[in-house]
Amino acid sequence: SETTTGTSSNSSQSTSNSGLAPNPTNATTKAAG
């Protein structure tokens, strides 16, 4: 899978956590963006 980020980044973020993708695990199915 592929995600492109730019001026309108749609990273989902909670109030306190970073919006970056968490470290991969074997259950990971796609890169977050």
Epitope: S1, S11, S16, S18, L20, A21, P22, N23
Partner: antibody, heavy 118, light 107 residues
Amino acid sequence: EVQLQQSGPELVKPGASVKISCKASGYSFTGYYMNWVKQSPEKSLEWIGEINPITGGTTYNQKFRAKATLTVDRSSSTAYMQLKSLTSEDSAVYYCTKRDYDTSLDYWGQGTTLIVSS
Amino acid sequence: DVQITQSPSYLAAFPGETITINCRASKSIKKYLAWYQEKPGKTNNLLIYSGSTLQSGIPSRFSGSGTGTDFTLTISSLEPEDFAMYYCQQHNEYPLTFGAGTKLELK
């Protein structure tokens, strides 16, 4: 000891493509995203994108979407970045860097210098 | 994209002095700012992440502060090996973005 060993300098002609490698050791290669960063005198540091070593899933900076392609070879714990349709503006130092969710870009390769010139 | 404004771009100091470098984000990045040191012939070194957390192995004379949009890197009692380039970088959202850098030179 975590190490990211990048391939050597490249001198290529405008319009050509180049593929830079980054061999990881000293940590679980599949446990962390591999990121790529461009450093040029004009623009300082620019994030190109990242790849999930398990799935091959990628996230790109929109600016580099048409320029860079990120891949991995899990069997050799190596990440690759291909740059295409090269111009003089692509002349820069390119870094691979391991991203940990908590600490961000915690280990960097030594950099690969790319010169695009006819 | 989150724009990061880093200042000053150049700083000269004596060993033993305390210096500060500032980064301002164009919008809130919560606590998610990292600081890096760049020296010729060495790989880039992560100093601080999440605004104020010292990376393992980094001397305690390095400290970071700030949340939201304004952040500061402080180096207390400068050592000769601290004269280098410093960059900040937000790790709150994609695309990751960096400050333009601060060159710390020996006065």
